[in-house]
Interface confidence: low
Amino acid sequence: NSLFNQEVQIPLTESYCGPCPKNWICYKNNCYQFFNESKNWYESQASCMSQNASLLKVYSKEDQDLLKLVKSYHWMGLVHIPTNGSWQWEDGSILSPNLLTIIEMQKGDCALYASSFKGYIENCSIPNTYICMQRTV
Amino acid sequence: NSLFNQEVQIPLTESYCGPCPKNWICYKNNCYQFFNESKNWYESQASCMSQNASLLKVYSKEDQDLLKLVKSYHWMGLVHIPTNGSWQWEDGSILSPNLLTIIEMQKGDCALYASSFKGYIENCSIPNTYICMQRTV
């Protein structure tokens, strides 16, 4: 079931989504919020944590296909571990090889999410807008 | 409460959103779905109607601020009535003056939604992706 449905059969089952923090976006039982205040990566992470959420984690092109539509650039929860060279999410999981196209425009250890599943490497101290995500149980 | 929160106070009230058709986006109790199959305006309208929804109606920058983030161009439910010159939604209501920036790039009687509350006039017979919307009661 894609956000970009080719043709949806009817009748469609009506269902509730969530629970999410009030006025967050709910999609396939994940909660998302876009924050327009520019913060560096660490401040963005702290802001999400303060709301019982984390910076965006991209884990599935199917479950998160709404991210195809997002314009502009926003901090996500992906960081480069200089000691071993890997890209990891905040929860310590390794970035799957086919989820994001990583584009190294800048030297840095953090990444900005851009539409169509692209990640732009950026200096973690640069202020940017950010996306928080809360996975429902 | 804006999608672009400057800073969200905690604790946030957790709530369910909907009900919506399965796997649609739910935001502020409205349901949205983006369709990647290109159709002309009339076919897009029929597709939304077949799912008990309508083409996107923009009625509030506050309640629909997620639309700021949408990239690309998609049919919405706005049509030009040539006999009297007005722009109306499918439900017959007139377009409020400060909701959309209408840009006449083409001659036509239908409109494409583009990010940041812009509407591009287009020939209704041109195929485009489209946005369906269902307002919850």
Epitope: - | G85, I94, P97, T101, I102, I103, M105, K107, K118, I121
Partner: antibody, heavy 121, light 107 residues
Framework: QEQLEQSGGGLVTPGGSLKLCCTA?????????MTWVRQAPGKGLEWIGC????????DYASWVNGRFTLSRDIDQSTACLQVNSLTAADTAMYYC??????????????WGQGTMVTVSS | DIQMTQSPSSLSASVGDRVTITCRAS??????LNWYQQKPGKAPNLLIY???SLQSGVPSRFSGSGSGTDYTLTISSLQPEDFATYYC?????????FGGGTKVEIK
């Protein structure tokens, strides 16, 4: 023929009020956002606000501050601008305008002839 | 509010000259820009809408271009009836705002 005919201007003392009106003919008044623009002598154009002929919905410039009120009479196809607490700074030519069919409410292809308001003691 | 800055404020030109007037918006207005001509004692007259679309009945010597924040009105060959004041207007968002005007005078 599509036309806007303005009436009402004149000389008024500071603190006074005036009602300017604009009568539409040759098109369906109900479907347009009728707009008011003013121009002080030797100066540029300044948008005041607009009112929808059918619904009566209104939008004003922020500087208006409640001193100006837009109204309309559907039966008479007339849009009016009530101006209160007038000062010398309000001395201007006042125009009503109608948007083009396809350009919606922000591009004006039909204008009234203008009506002069002079505020002086 | 979006500020519109027009330049020059006045210019002198001769019949047959190519005349260019510029208008700069304080923020991106997405091509939603109009140009009007106004003659003394008359109401403005729409020349160009949506930055580059020629209004019906307007001579083809008038053209508009631009995007983002910067826009230009060009008169390819100035005619006697073109001596007037020209205004740009942003049609992107309320409140609608106009440039200060450019007076085109006979040299």
């Amino acid at each position: 023929q599509e036309q806007l005919e303005q009436s009402g201007g004149g000389l008024v003392t500071p603190g006074g009020s005036l009602k300017l009106c604009c009568t539409a003919s040759g098109f369906d008044f109900n479907t347009f956002w009728m707009t008011w623009v003013r121009q002080a002598p030797g100066k540029g154009l300044e948008w005041i606000g607009c009112i929808h002929g059918g619904s009566g919905s209104r939008d004003y410039a922020s500087w208006v501050n409640g001193r100006f009120t837009l109204s309309r009479d559907i039966d008479q196809s007339t849009a009016c601008l009530q101006v209160n607490s007038l000062t010398a700074a309000d001395t201007a030519m006042y125009y009503c305008a109608r948007p083009g069919y396809r350009s919606w409410s922000k591009t004006f292809d039909l204008w009234g002839q203008g009506t002069m308001v002079t505020v002086s003691s | 509010d979006i500020q519109m800055t027009q330049s020059p404020s006045s210019l002198s030109a001769s019949v047959g000259d190519r005349v260019t007037i510029t208008c700069r918006a304080s923020q991106d207005i997405s091509g939603a820009l109009n140009w009007y001509q106004q003659k003394p004692g008359k109401a403005p007259n729409l020349l160009i809408y949506a930055a580059s679309s020629l209004q019906s009945g307007v001579p083809s010597r008038f053209s508009g271009s631009g995007s983002g924040t910067d826009y230009t009105l060009t008169i390819s060959s100035l005619q006697p009836e073109d001596f007037a004041t020209y205004y740009c207007q942003q049609a992107n968002s309320f409140p609608l705002t106009f440039g200060g005007g450019t007076k085109v005078e006979i040299k």
